[in-house]
Interface confidence: medium
Amino acid sequence: CDLPQTHSLGNRRALILLAQMRRISPFSCLKDRHDFEFPQEEFDDKQFQKAQAISVLHEMIQQTFNLFSTKDSSAALDETLLDEFYIELDQQLNDLESCVMQEVGVIESPLMYEDSILAVRKYFQRITLYLTEKKYSSCAWEVVLSEIYRSFSLSINLQKRLKSKE
């Protein structure tokens, strides 16, 4: 499955939007730093089946969408940037869903990839828990935005590697 050229443009736009959402200097939030234990191994260049990689990427973007779709994110972050981000993620998800259908034949993630998908879900659960514990403070959001920027970048790298293998 070939992801369209617009997909990588959309990835870049999503990263720019994440960067624009950050409002305060990360240096003023050093005490709030947290290790969310990003499941790096799921994004490393192990002998992924393409369908598995696409399923993991889809889960990553879907969970990102869910995280930013809450009332708490709407209250804390710039409304228009947030909406642009939703729309961008939606287009990314549409592209990946088309690919999952071609590679796997069903949209729901196959059970054989469940461990990888579960690792991504648990990662986002840790992020949500952190935000709750920190009462969705502005510094907590800065830390989370920084983390999502990093994880989103890693998922983009995986997409690039998939493309280069074609």
């Epitope: 909406d83 642009e84 939703y86 729309i87 939606d90 998800l93 549409n94 869903e97 949209i107």
Partner: antibody, heavy 118, light 109 residues
Framework: QVQLKQSGPGLVQPSQSLSITCTVS????????VHWIRQSPGKGLEWLGV???????DYNAAFISRLSITKDNSKSQFFFKMNSLQAKDTAIYYC????????????WGQGTLVTVSA | QIVLTQSPTIMSASLGERVTMTCTAS???????LHWYQQKPGSSPKLLIY???NLASGVPARFSGSGSGTSYSLTISNMEAEDAATYYC??????????FGGGTKLEIK
Amino acid sequence: QVQLKQSGPGLVQPSQSLSITCTVSGFSLTSYGVHWIRQSPGKGLEWLGVIWSGGNTDYNAAFISRLSITKDNSKSQFFFKMNSLQAKDTAIYYCARGRGNYVPFTYWGQGTLVTVSA
Amino acid sequence: QIVLTQSPTIMSASLGERVTMTCTASSSVSSTYLHWYQQKPGSSPKLLIYSTSNLASGVPARFSGSGSGTSYSLTISNMEAEDAATYYCHQYHRSPPMTFGGGTKLEIK
């Protein structure tokens, strides 16, 4: 792949109600909402309402008194019901998938041509 | 509700010609929420451009969109036979209802 297939009557008597079913495949109903839009020669494309993934609904104020949108997650079906139809309700009725509030529609049903006539 | 007015209502263009159509909103719309669809006879609308200027998946690069505030436009740099269709602009923000323009029908000259 993602599909939305509509089924419903082509002809409705004046003052009767219209029921259309939108059966979807290729995506999870817990991640998406489905909007209903109609297209009539006189008024062009007109948004009627939406049922969100959680089951809550929003309706166009002009139709709120005679419109009902529901769904059955287990059957992957969305249901559209409009009461008290008049000749001016003659149109093509579409269901379309939306992920979030402001996201444009990438997938549409094939449309159901509804004629209101005695 | 926001009214979207498209002009012209009908236009014709020769193959290879540059085509521009406009969409004017009755009050300001953020560029994030302004989208364009293409519809051919007997088919459902197809997303063409989202958030004013971003091409939807699989849309040829000859299509482009621009604008802000109350004035938006869709341009085809090099008209092809398959571009003959009706084009609709669409806006949706936080307060329903979303609205669509009346459409611009593009024919081949």
